[in-house]
C-alpha cells in the first residue's frame, strides 16, 4: 500500500493540485492526530486555512477551555479549528493571519497581519501579531501586545472582571479590549448597542455586532 499523503495546512493541499473550496483533513508532521478544516482556495490566491467562522449563530461559542483547545462546530459552517492545532502549526513556520468581516449593511472589510502565531497551552495560547494592513482599521482591534486566551472556565485576562463570562466566548481578552469575534451572535436590527456581541472596534465601534467573520491563515511564503 502506498504511503498516505498528508497535508499540514490548506496551502499544502492547494499546491498538491486540490484547488476547490471545501473541507480537507489536515495532519501535523510527526503526528497522527487529524483535524477537519475548511480550505478557501479562491480568495487572494487560495491556500487559506480557515481557523474561525461566524455566519448565522447556529453554533454556541461560549465553550470551555478544552473545547477551544481541540476545536468545535462544523467546518462547512460556523466553527473554531482548535488552539492546539493552530499553535503547533504556526510555530513551525511563519504564517499570515487574515480576518474578513461583514456588517449588516452589506459592507466588507479585512485586517491582515504579516506574522501570526499562538504560544503553547502552557503559555495560555497567547496571541502574537505583527504588521497590520487592511480596511478594517489602522490600529489592531486585537489588543497589542498580545494577550493570553480566556474562556468561561479559564480567566486569563487583565480585568478584575471575567471578560469571557461577561462578553461570552473565548478570546484574547485584555481588560476587556477592542475585539471579540467569538461573542454572542445577534441578528439584524438587534445588533447595535450590544456590549457582548461580535466586535471589531476599529472598524464598527464598540456596540456593533457583526454579521459574519472569518479568520484564516496561510504561510507567509505562499
Amino acid at each position: 500500500k502506498g504511503e498516505q499523503i498528508s497535508f499540514r495546512d490548506c496551502a499544502e493541499v492547494f499546491k498538491s493540485g486540490h484547488t476547490t473550496n471545501g473541507v480537507y483533513t489536515l495532519t501535523l508532521p510527526n503526528s497522527t492526530e487529524e483535524v477537519k478544516a475548511y480550505c478557501d482556495m479562491e480568495a487572494g490566491g487560495g491556500g487559506w486555512t480557515i481557523i474561525q467562522r461566524r455566519e448565522d449563530g447556529s453554533v454556541d461559542f461560549q465553550r470551555t477551555w478544552k473545547e477551544y483547545k481541540v476545536g468545535f462546530g462544523n467546518p462547512s459552517g460556523e466553527y473554531w479549528l482548535g488552539n492546539e492545532f493552530v499553535s503547533q502549526l504556526t510555530n513551525q513556520q511563519r504564517y499570515v493571519l487574515k480576518i474578513h468581516l461583514k456588517d449588516w449593511e452589506g459592507n466588507e472589510a479585512y485586517s491582515l497581519y504579516e506574522h501570526f502565531y499562538l504560544s503553547s497551552e502552557e503559555l495560555n495560547y497567547r496571541i502574537h501579531l505583527k504588521g497590520l494592513t487592511g480596511t478594517a482599521g489602522k490600529i489592531s482591534s486585537i489588543s497589542q501586545p498580545g494577550n493570553d486566551f480566556s474562556t468561561k472556565d479559564a480567566d486569563n485576562d487583565k480585568c478584575i472582571c471575567k471578560c469571557s463570562q461577561m462578553l461570552t466566548g473565548g478570546w484574547w481578552f485584555d481588560a476587556c479590549g477592542p475585539s471579540n469575534l467569538n461573542g454572542m451572535y445577534y441578528p439584524q436590527r438587534q445588533n447595535t448597542n450590544k456590549f457582548n456581541g461580535i466586535k471589531w472596534y476599529y472598524w464598527k465601534g464598540s456596540g456593533y455586532s457583526l454579521k459574519g467573520t472569518t479568520m484564516m491563515i496561510r504561510p507567509a511564503g505562499f
Epitope: 487574515k98 491582515l112 501579531l129 504588521g131 494592513t133 489602522k138 489592531s140 497589542q144
Partner: antibody, heavy 123, light 113 residues
Framework: QVQLVQSGAEVKKPGSSVKVSCKAS????????INWVRQAPGQGLEWMGK????????SSNEKFKGRVTITADKSTSTAYMELSSLRSEDTAVYYC????????????????WGQGTLVTVSS | EIVMTQSPATLSVSPGERATLSCKSS????????????LAWYQQKPGQAPRLLIY???TRESGIPARFSGSGSGTEFTLTISSLQSEDFAVYYC?????????FGQGTKLEIK
C-alpha cells in the same frame, strides 16, 4: 546598510499612467512595510498607501479612488506604485519609505526614505 | 479623516535658542490598547527626503540628537528643540498614524532670526 533606490524622473501626458519603482537592500524585505508619500512642488506631504511585501496586502488613501495600485516583488525586493488617469495636479515628487512593525503594536515611523522620483504631468 | 494642524506656519528663532512647535489633531491619536499616541515628527530640508525625528509622540529615533524632544498625548503635541543649531533650520511635519488615511500637518518652517 538600508537603502531604498527609486526609478528616475518621468514626464507623462494627462490621462496616462506612471509606475515608480523602489528597490530595497540591506534588510529583509518582507519584514517591513513600504509606504508611498508624495509632495507637490512647494507643498506638504501626502500619504498614498502602503504594502506589506510579505503578503502583498496593502492599504491606500481613498482620495485616489482606485487610481493607485501598490505592489511588491519579493524576488527582487522591489516595491511599485502605479498611478493612473494622471492629471496636472499629480505633478509631484513621489517617495517610498520603509516603516517598521513589531509585536508590541507600537508605531515606529517611516525611518528610511528613497531619494524621490519627480513625475511631471504635462500636455 | 484626521486633520493635523501645525502652528505657527513660520517660526523665526536665533541659533542657540529654544524652538517650540505645536501640532493638534482633530481626533485623539491615542490607542485604546496600549494608551500610546500614534504620532510622528519629521524634518525636511530643501531638495531632500523627510527625516524621522520622533515616533510614538515622544520616542526619539536612533541617531537623532538629544536636543530634539516630543511631548503630548491625545490631540495636542509639541516638538521642542532645546538649543538650535544651524543644521536644524528646516520644515517640520507632524503625522497621524492612528487612522487611515495617514495624514500630515501642513508643516512649520523654522527659519533663522
Amino acid at each position: 546598510q538600508v537603502q531604498l533606490v527609486q526609478s528616475g524622473a518621468e514626464v507623462k501626458k494627462p490621462g496616462s499612467s506612471v509606475k515608480v519603482s523602489c528597490k530595497a537592500s540591506g534588510y529583509i524585505f518582507i519584514d517591513y512595510f513600504i509606504n508611498w508619500v508624495r509632495q507637490a512642488p512647494g507643498q506638504g506631504l501626502e500619504w498614498m498607501g502602503k504594502i506589506g511585501p510579505g503578503s502583498g496586502s496593502s492599504s491606500s488613501n481613498e482620495k485616489f479612488k482606485g487610481r493607485v495600485t501598490i505592489t511588491a516583488d519579493k524576488s527582487t525586493s522591489t516595491a511599485y506604485m502605479e498611478l493612473s488617469s494622471l492629471r496636472s495636479e499629480d505633478t509631484a515628487v513621489y517617495y517610498c519609505a520603509r516603516e517598521a512593525f513589531d509585536y508590541d503594536g507600537d508605531y515606529y515611523g517611516m525611518a528610511y526614505w528613497g531619494q524621490g522620483t519627480l513625475v511631471t504631468v504635462s500636455s | 479623516e484626521i486633520v493635523m494642524t501645525q502652528s505657527p506656519a513660520t517660526l523665526s528663532v536665533s541659533p542657540g535658542e529654544r524652538a517650540t512647535l505645536s501640532c493638534k489633531s482633530s481626533q485623539s491619536l491615542l490607542s485604546s490598547g496600549n494608551q500610546k499616541s500614534f504620532l510622528a515628527w519629521y524634518q525636511q530640508k530643501p531638495g531632500q527626503a523627510p527625516r524621522l525625528l520622533i515616533y510614538g509622540a515622544s520616542t526619539r529615533e536612533s541617531g537623532i540628537p538629544a536636543r530634539f524632544s516630543g511631548s503630548g498625548s491625545g490631540t495636542e503635541f509639541t516638538l521642542t528643540i532645546s538649543s538650535l543649531q544651524s543644521e536644524d533650520f528646516a520644515v517640520y511635519y507632524c503625522q497621524n498614524d492612528h487612522s487611515y488615511p495617514i495624514t500630515f500637518g501642513q508643516g512649520t518652517k523654522l527659519e533663522i532670526k
